[in-house]
Interface confidence: low
């Protein structure tokens, strides 16, 4: 029988009751139109909805939109457009959340075409109060706030200058133009790109990466015949046109632009992008495209400075047309990531890697599935999940997978068992011990989300029907109750709960149709008195992450040690609560090749550990590029996995020498880098 | 061994209705899609209907909707396709498939249902 | 909905020939794509899955090939029982379906 329908299940005492006592309607006075909501601040119970309504007239669109206003996580709303002098606010730009705890939200409004510049509502105390503020500039992008600064503000205009505010938009200086992109670094530091010759598309591959880092009085340009750059971790990367034809490369900089090194990946044609899929203060992971419009490319891992990289994974699914890919950061278990595959016969595969991108392997196959008409063999197969590109081809997959560093090993997706993602409907899948294992949790597409740490799961199934009710889950995902929660069904447009997955609060949003009207309407369902008590010690118990093989004394270990956690059992239904903290105990594990990536110049052979010189460089001098110098590497063809903490064991030596020999790989050598001051 | 066994075929006046039925064996049921396929006679194949694993999804071609219904009994093994205001062109063989994903992939004999007064 | 078109729609071979049937789409169904075998009086038979994989119990001497629109299912080297219709189906996004409208094989 489906999981949630056998007679094991223990049912969740008086829940109809305890869940109807719990449930908040809210009715919004709009047609229906669009809807934006925003969470402000964390554990504040503040929710920002802006619903706007644009009614086509002859000759132009009239637009409406009103601003409501909660402080009990979406139970009750206040009609708050007064308070933005009832404004029409522009949706494209959505709320400007500032960062942290700060209470601070900016909203852009629409203006008249004639209009000298643009306006904002800013609030600083949680949307209790706006300022109405008019720029002198029309904006073109979203106000943008400094990570440590949230006083500090950029914005680009519409003709292209760089504007910087420092007291929370009260006050504009433009302190650059012919701004192509800009970005917030650390310290309160400012990347951007300038083009000279006319706009940011005749210049691409003949830009200036630029960096301040006080806020406009002084400048410094730190490298030249830009394409583009990004920032990733401690990492500032950026992909320079080379001398002599069209190509271009990464080059990598840790120090914030002063000094930069190649990294050792292929260079790409005008056709063809670099994307860093995830980075940390470790390492790296970059997608490198295939010549031709293959749809696929190669994924690279970077060692501790971002140079030296390792073939990760080849023909990975990312998609030039539309720019997909389903690369995701499993974030509730350390080291996981998934991804997607084009094999050669154009079928498209999940693979999965539980060490940072060392080795990927397929998902098992849920034990209670069977595979589908895609597998070769029916008795061997694989989990295949839905991700960003599936969604992408308007398959019938509401949601991408989900996980969160709270719900240790807790990871949701849909997906299809075979030998490759199958077109038909998809099913939801969990995984409670992130990702090497999976069940079968809920039969077709749904809606979901992870509330209370995981002491709860809900979901709403993806129907064209109305629906009215809700399905929950207190033991991750094995037994379901469902809950109606109102009598005249809606049509569902989305689920809404707190970042962070602490809280008990739901919000189904979705809108009423009657003959005349349509109405946006929310039913917030607070699960608390669902789990009565606090969880206490015994309720949980001690979980190794990782573990595959409790016979051997290294079980667990993965980039260099183990980690011990305190999880919920599944029985136990009680509350983890606001405040829960995960418990882990790590311990170190030994040195095995397994915590050595392949050094510059070699690789690993399949389902080999050891690292082999490459043929093609056997007896040649490894000469390379670092911070504008030559160096010279002898090695035996190992280096430490970034992040890697293992001690003892095997310990591969290397040693880099300076060849005091300049290579700019026609960067800007540091010596040679202009500054100015305004 | 996987088996599909049709039944319900038969004779019907034009308007009439009919219940198909499609008895499942030698393999898991309800972990598996299903599907009636239809082939009037010399004539190539036409789908019919699609029901997921657990019956929560139904799938039909438009010129079929709101005439045919598919549904399955898991306790059962069983498939069922309900006809209504049948008409001389709805006259073929009907076979229930085992629908995993990309592929039908096993079939019934097939069961003739014939419309004609 | 995706248009099949299936050629030829008939075809007269020798044993030992070389057969190949094709399938065109009017869009693009990324492999999505079942070859089936029926002989007269008898029930659909699965003979290729996914474009190019060959099912469970299908001689070797058939094998699928194709992506994007254009799909061909070839017989290396014919044998008597392979004289049937032949039918292609897509499986890509939403219903319908849509089956090709068959090939006859036929004997020289």
């Known amino acids: 029988s489906a999981p949630g329908e056998d007679e094991e299940c223990g049912r969740v005492r008086d829940f109809v009751a305890k869940l109807a006592n719990n449930t908040h309607q809210h009715v919004f006075d709009d047609l229906r139109g669009s809807v934006s909501l925003s969470w402000v601040g964390d554990s504040t119970g503040v929710i920002l909805v802006l619903t706007t309504f644009h009614v086509p007239l002859v000759i132009m669109t009239f637009g409406q939109s009103k601003l409501y206003r909660s402080e009990d996580y979406g139970k009750n709303f206040k009609d708050i457009t007064d308070l933005i002098n009832n404004t029409f606010i522009r949706t494209e730009f959505g709320m400007a959340i500032g960062p942290e705890n700060s209470g601070k939200v900016v909203l852009t409004a629409e203006v008249s075409g004639g209009s000298r510049g643009g306006r904002i509502f800013r609030s600083s105390d949680f949307a209790k109060n706006f300022v109405q503020t008019d720029l002198p500039f029309h904006p073109l992008t979203q106000m943008m706030y400094s990570p440590q600064n949230s006083d500090y503000l950029l914005a680009l205009s519409t003709e292209n200058g760089l504007w910087v505010s420092k007291n929370f938009g009260g006050k504009w200086e433009e302190i650059h133009k012919a701004v192509c992109l800009a970005k917030w670094g650390s310290d309160n530091t400012i990347f951007f790109t300038t083009y000279a010759n006319g706009s940011c598309k005749a210049d691409l591959g003949a830009l200036e990466l630029w960096r301040t880092s006080d806020l406009g009085k002084s400048f410094k340009t730190i490298g030249v015949k830009i394409y583009s750059f990004g920032l990733g971790g401690r990492f500032l990367f950026a992909s320079v046109m080379a001398d002599k034809d069209t190509t271009r490369r990464i080059h990598v900089s840790t120090d914030q632009g002063d000094t930069w090194s190649m990294a050792q990946l292929p260079s790409v044609g005008q056709e063809q992008f670099y994307s860093i899929l995830a980075a940390n203060d470790d390492m790296v992971f970059m997608h490198v495209d295939e010549p031709g419009d293959t749809g696929f490319g190669t994924i690279f891992t970077s060692d501790d400075r971002g140079i030296v990289y390792s073939k990760s994974l080849d023909r990975h699914l990312y998609t030039t047309t539309g720019g997909e890919t389903d690369f995701t950061n499993v974030t509730s278990l350390r080291g996981v990531y998934i991804t997607s595959v084009l094999s050669e016969d154009n079928s498209i595969q999940t693979m999965i890697t539980f060490d940072q991108g060392g080795r990927w392997t397929h998902l098992r196959k849920p034990e209670n599935s069977e595979c589908d008409a895609t597998a070769k063999n029916k008795n061997e197969c694989s989990l295949h999940i839905h991700a960003s590109y599936s969604i992408s081809q308007k398959l019938n997959v509401p949601m991408a997978p989900l996980s969160e560093p709270n719900a240790v090993g807790i990871v949701i997706a849909h997906g299809s068992v075979g030998d490759a993602i199958s077109v038909m409907v998809p099913d939801v899948y969990i995984s409670d011990d992130g990702g090497y294992s999976w069940t079968k949790m809920l039969e077709g597409p749904h809606y979901y989300t992870i509330l209370d740490s995981g002491g709860i799961i809900v979901a709403i199934e993806h129907s064209s029907r109305p629906i009215n009710v809700i399905k929950f889950s207190t033991d991750e995902g094995q037994c379901w109750q469902t809950y109606t929660f109102t009598r005249d069904p809606i049509y569902f447009t989305g689920l809404a709960s707190e970042p962070g997955a602490r809280s008990m609060n739901i919000s189904i949003w979705g809108f009423t149709e009657s003959f005349l009207t349509s109405q946006w309407v929310s039913y917030t369902i607070d699960f608390k008195d669902i789990l009565e008590r606090n969880c206490e010690e015994k309720d949980y118990t001690i979980w190794l992450a990782h573990s595959t093989d409790p016979e051997d004394y290294e079980d667990g270990c993965i980039l260099g040690y183990k980690e011990q956690f305190l999880r919920l059992r599944k029985s136990s239904v009680c509350q983890n609560g606001r405040d829960y903290v995960v418990t882990k105990q790590p311990s170190i594990c030994l040195c095995s090749l397994e915590d050595f990536l392949c050094d510059f110049g070699y690789y690993r052979p399949e389902n080999d550990s050891k690292c082999v010189e490459q043929p093609e460089l056997k007896g040649h001098d490894l000469e390379f590029c670092l911070y504008g110098r030559e160096e010279h590497l002898t090695t035996n063809g190992y280096r430490k996995i970034p992040g890697d903490k293992c001690q003892g064991g095997v310990n591969p030596v290397r040693e880099v020498k300076d060849l005091k020999k300049k290579c700019t790989s026609n960067f800007l050598s540091p010596e040679k880098q202009n500054s100015k001051s305004n | 061994e996987v088996q599909l066994v049709e039944s319900g075929g038969g004779l019907v006046q034009p308007g009439g209705s009919l219940r198909l039925s499609c008895a499942a064996s030698?393999?898991?049921?309800?972990?598996?899609?299903m599907s009636w396929v239809r082939q009037a006679p010399g004539k190539g194949l036409e789908w019919v209907a699609t029901i997921s694993s657990g019956g929560i999804y139904t799938y039909y071609p438009d010129i079929l909707k709101g005439r045919f219904t598919i549904s399955r009994d898991n306790a059962k093994n069983s498939l069922y396709g309900q006809m209504n205001s049948l008409r001389a062109e709805d006259t073929a063989v009907y076979y229930c498939a085992r629908h995993p994903g990309g592929a039908m992939d096993y079939w019934g004999q097939g069961t003739l249902v014939t419309v004609s007064s | 909905d995706i248009q099949m078109t299936q050629s030829p729609s008939s075809l007269s071979a020798s044993v030992g020939d070389r057969v190949t049937i094709t399938c065109r789409v009017s869009e693009n169904i990324y492999s999505n794509l079942a070859w089936y075998q029926q002989k007269p009086g008898k029930s659909p038979k699965l003979l290729v899955y996914?474009?190019?994989n060959i099912a469970d119990g299908v001689p070797s001497r058939f094998s699928g090939s194709g992506s994007g629109t254009d799909y061909t299912l070839t017989i290396s080297s014919l044998q008597p029982e392979d004289f049937a219709t032949y039918y292609c189906q897509h499986f890509w996004g939403t219903p319908p379906w849509t089956f090709g409208q068959g090939t006859k094989l036929e004997i020289k």
């Open positions: 030698g393999f898991t049921f309800n972990i598996y899609g």
């Open positions: 996914a474009a190019t």
